[in-house]
């Protein structure tokens, strides 16, 4: 014989000894009908705030207040936003590894420092976990066949570099 609890809708509960669908009491929910009990609604307060309110058919969803971010499945914990020089991982905020940086507050990932030599430039200022390297002007490289002559220009003390 089919149990009439099987026909109960979400938002209700039903006990097998008295198989009548009853509405979930306030502050409780059931996303599946026919369960013997409704679940207690989640509360979002303190470092949490509501992203969804609890209804008879679904639980509340929480998010973290400004300046904090969620950790864990369904935002079980709130952690202070990462500072520049850090990135958010599953384990929380982690300092950027050597050779990488993040200059953003609360968001972003650690990115590799710019490789100045790829552009034929020198490193003017070394990078940190919070700041990228500063590249200098392009390095002038000379081939063996290049001759250089310094010729006076514009009167005394004036010189110009000529690459021949």
């Amino acid at each position: 014989v089919q149990n009439s609890c099987d026909n109960c809708q979400p938002g209700t509960f039903c006990r097998k000894y008295n198989p009548v669908c009853k509405s979930c009491p306030p502050s409780t929910f059931s996303s599946i009908g026919g369960q013997p009990n409704c679940n207690i609604c989640r509360v979002c307060a303190g470092y949490f705030r509501f992203k969804k309110f609890c209804s008879s058919t679904h639980n509340a969803e929480c998010e973290c207040i400004e300046g904090f971010h969620c950790l864990g499945p369904q935002c079980t914990r709130c952690e202070k936003d990462c500072r520049p020089g850090q990135e958010l991982t599953k384990q929380g905020c982690k300092t950027c590894s050597l050779g990488t940086f993040n200059d953003q507050n609360g968001t972003g990932v650690c990115r590799p420092w710019t490789n100045c030599s790829l552009d034929g430039r020198s490193v003017l200022k070394t990078g940190t976990t919070e700041k990228d390297v500063v590249c200098g002007p392009p390095v002038v490289s000379f081939s063996p066949s290049t001759t250089i002559s310094v010729t006076p220009e514009g009167g005394p003390g004036g010189h110009s570099l000529q690459v021949l």
Partner: antibody
Framework: QVQLKEAGPGLVQPTQTLSLTCTVS????????VHWIRQPPGKGLEWMGI???????DYNSAIKSRLSISRDTSKSQVFLKINSLQTDDTAMYYC???????WGQGVMVTVSS | DIVLTQSPTTIAASPGEKVTITCRAS?????MYWYQQKSGASPKLWIY???KLASGVPNRFSGSGSGTSYSLALNTMETEDAATYYC?????????FGSGTKLEIK
């Protein structure tokens, strides 16, 4: 900064459908939900419903059968529709951000023939 | 639905006087929220998470309570505090408001 602004007809005939628009700025509808609340003249506040960040909705069971809330995220607009209007639907209609920290200035709707 | 019963309906207080407004819930709620509304204006969130003052709310206001009994207290009444105050629960939908308490200046 965060702003919400309601717009709609001031006068509606009984049995007709009321359509209101809430235009928001300073936040995204894909991040935060928006409520509709109404207040009949000289009376208290009544929560009507909410559309969430993901488009899901919750309604006040007392008026759920006549109510529909939708949105257009590209225009940052939330819509309220109430059908089969009665004179006791005459009220100031407000929209508010999910945490009720920002409200629109409200739009007065009179249901009368 | 959770019914919130506010008392008193109206209260008149002299400047400097202490005022307490109560809100009782038909079933237990986790936190209470309070709003201030002045004539012709939109409501303003006044107290959240039972006891935290919203931005810009003077600290002569306070909130307390748990379970089914909550209150808003005003330590020393000032003329600018004359308004209607509403309690509200967020524990489950439908979110419900109290019927309001009109605070007048004597």
């Amino acid at each position: 900064q965060v702003q919400l602004k309601e717009a709609g007809p001031g006068l509606v005939q009984p049995t007709q459908t009321l359509s209101l628009t809430c235009t928001v700025s300073g936040f995204s509808l894909t991040s935060d939900g928006v409520h509709w609340i109404r207040q009949p003249p000289g009376k208290g506040l009544e929560w009507m419903g909410i559309i969430y960040y993901d488009g899901g909705t919750d309604y006040n069971s007392a008026i759920k059968s006549r109510l529909s809330i939708s949105r257009d995220t590209s225009k940052s607009q939330v819509f309220l529709k109430i059908n089969s209007l009665q004179t006791d639907d005459t009220a100031m209609y407000y929209c508010a951000r999910i945490h009720f920290d920002y409200w629109g200035q409200g739009v007065m709707v009179t249901v009368s023939s | 639905d959770i019914v919130l019963t506010q008392s008193p309906t109206t209260i008149a207080a002299s400047p400097g006087e202490k005022v307490t407004i109560t809100c009782r819930a038909s079933s237990s709620v986790s936190y209470m929220y309070w709003y201030q509304q002045k004539s012709g204006a939109s409501p303003k969130l006044w107290i959240y998470d039972t006891s935290k003052l919203a931005s810009g709310v003077p600290n002569r206001f306070s909130g307390s309570g748990s379970g089914t009994s909550y209150s808003l207290a005003l330590n020393t009444m000032e003329t600018e505090d004359a308004a209607t105050y509403y309690c509200q629960q967020w524990s489950s939908t439908p979110l419900t408001f109290g019927s309001g308490t009109k605070l007048e200046i004597k």
